[in-house]
Interface confidence: medium
């Protein structure tokens, strides 16, 4: 911009707000208004008006002619199959015409399930707040992802934070410790397995507790890569109700076995 | 004709739950907002809750927050209210509304306004 | 206690002119639209008046509403026998996200 000798511009429709203010001095300073004609469309007040002729004090921004977001949509989770919705609100003081769109990872949804309506608030549309919802329907794992909302009208768009949708599956096992009855001296051997979305954490307890003696005589051995739970040289007070939970951001679920224990 | 109608009042014990249906006719349910109101008999009228005309956005009175669940089927053009934990206070005619909706250049315009009633149902929370 | 305040009964006689008024704050009268409601006696209400001072088609022009910062009015000209009824002002309250009533008036038309 230092080596600008000429800049034409000739527009009646400037919108002669607070954001306006700067453009007549930085011209006028760089000796580039002869080839502008520029003049107001909004407010009412200056509409007609040259930006030279309005006073700077006169740049304001008491409305809100643009779109401005008051209720963002929220980062969710949901469990596939569910049905979830986004919502997303802005106010404006225009009632020039409102457009709505969704992106999905900054892509805009060209079929989106949209609900878009306005309420009147206010009498002769001082401030309308217009609302756009989006309805995902039976969420699988293709619709997670980051959603914004685009609310756009004659002056601008304005752009809501990004939501973040999460799909999760409950855990469920895909096997389960069963009842056993073993000799002391011998090895315990309990199984449970689970899927999920994420992927489900297995913790075993015994009667209730995670402190038992077999745990703290490290007896106890789970195998990182295994669905197996093994207790090495078992003892009589090993005996119980032991408690397999597979646990993941959308839930728990536990499967109980009992361990009894025959003196050799 | 436009026309609701609704049903579902009776004596329910306090604590005690209800259902409330409100069925629509005569126009395009799926394109107006709804609203439930109250009125103790003699008394003053209550706003109780609204729902959009998607049933995506919902509000309700403080005083049946937690308690009361507003929701429509569409397909079905009714509106519904379930009543849970009431208490003797609830005890009133309850209305179903229509909120007032002008559509024009393909967007709906909302006011804060009921222009058809249904003629009331009456809850009564007894022991 | 209703949050938009009305007085709890007027009157007048056939053919007067009587004004309801309708008092509230800034969250709901002061930003937001007004509605005036009709109730005969043993039947639903009935929308008179929205968005401040609109009527909805079939109310008479006898029936008109307006509004100033955190107060509204209704006014009744040309009073009928059957305009005896109550009357409530509503608006939308931004504070409670709520629809707010007023307390009703009752008019008496001697």
């Known amino acids: 911009m230092k080596n600008l000798k000429e800049l034409h511009i000739s527009s009646d429709s400037f919108l002669c707000d607070c954001q306006l203010k700067w453009l007549p001095p930085w011209l006028i300073g760089r000796m580039l208004q002869a080839f502008v004609t520029a003049t107001c469309a909004h407010p009412e007040s200056l509409k007609g008006q040259s930006i030279f002729s309005v006073p700077p004090e006169s740049f304001v921004c008491d409305d809100f002619l643009k779109p401005q977001i008051i209720t963002q949509p929220e980062t969710t989770m949901a469990m596939v199959g569910k049905d979830i919705r986004f919502t997303c609100s802005a106010a404006s003081s225009s009632s020039s015409p409102m457009t709505f769109a969704w992106k999905k990872d900054n892509e805009v949804l060209t079929n989106a399930d949209m609900e878009n309506f306005v309420h009147v608030h206010a009498q002769d549309g001082e401030v309308m707040e217009y609302t756009t919802i989006l309805h995902l329907r039976q969420v699988t794992f293709g619709h997670e992802g980051r959603y914004q909302c685009v609310i756009t009208n004659h002056f601008g768009s304005t752009y809501s934070h990004k939501a973040r949708l999460t799909v999760n599956v409950l855990p469920s096992f895909t096997k389960t410790p069963h009842d056993i009855t073993i000799r002391t001296t011998t090895m315990a051997r309990l199984e449970c397995a689970a899927t999920g979305h994420p992927n489900p954490q297995i913790a075993w307890q015994k009667d209730g507790g995670t402190d038992f003696p077999a745990a703290r005589e490290r007896r106890m051995h789970v195998m990182p890569d295994d669905d197996v739970f093994f207790i090495t040289d078992v003892k009589i007070d090993d005996a119980g109700v032991y408690s397999c939970t597979a646990q993941n951001s959308a839930g728990s679920i536990s499967a109980n076995a009992t361990l009894t224990v025959l003196e050799t | 004709e436009v026309q609701l109608l609704e049903s579902g009042g009776g004596l329910v014990q306090p604590g005690g739950s209800l259902r409330l249906s409100c069925a629509a006719s005569?126009?395009?349910?799926?394109?107006?907002?709804m609203s439930w109101v109250r009125q103790v008999p003699g008394k003053g009228l209550e706003w109780v809750s609204w729902i959009s005309h998607g049933g995506g956005s919902i509000y309700y009175a403080d005083s049946v927050k937690g308690r009361f669940t507003i929701s429509r089927d569409n397909s079905k053009n009714t509106l519904y209210l379930q009543m849970n934990s009431l208490r003797a206070e609830d005890t009133a005619v309850y209305y179903c509304a229509r909120g007032l909706g002008l559509c024009k250049t393909g967007l709906c315009y909302y006011y804060d306004a009921m222009d058809v009633w249904g003629q009331g149902t009456l809850v009564t929370v007894s022991s | 206690q209703s949050v938009l305040t009305q007085p709890p009964s007027a009157s007048g006689t056939p053919g007067q002119r009587v004004t309801i008024s309708c008092t509230g704050s800034?969250?709901?009268?002061?930003?937001?639209?007004v509605t005036w409601y009709q109730q005969l006696p043993g039947t639903a209400p009935k929308l008179l008046i929205y968005a401040d001072n609109n009527r909805p088609s079939g109310v008479p022009d006898r029936f008109s509403g307006s509004k100033s910062g955190t107060s509204a009015s209704l006014a009744i000209s040309g009073l009928r026998s059957e305009d005896e009824a109550d009357y409530y002002c509503?608006?939308?309250?931004?504070?409670?996200?709520?629809?707010?009533f007023g307390g009703g008036t009752k008019l008496t038309v001697l």
């Open positions: 509503a608006a939308w309250d931004s504070s409670l996200s709520a629809y707010v």
């Open positions: 005569g126009f395009t349910f799926s394109d107006y907002d």
């Open positions: 800034s969250s709901n009268i002061g930003n937001n639209s």
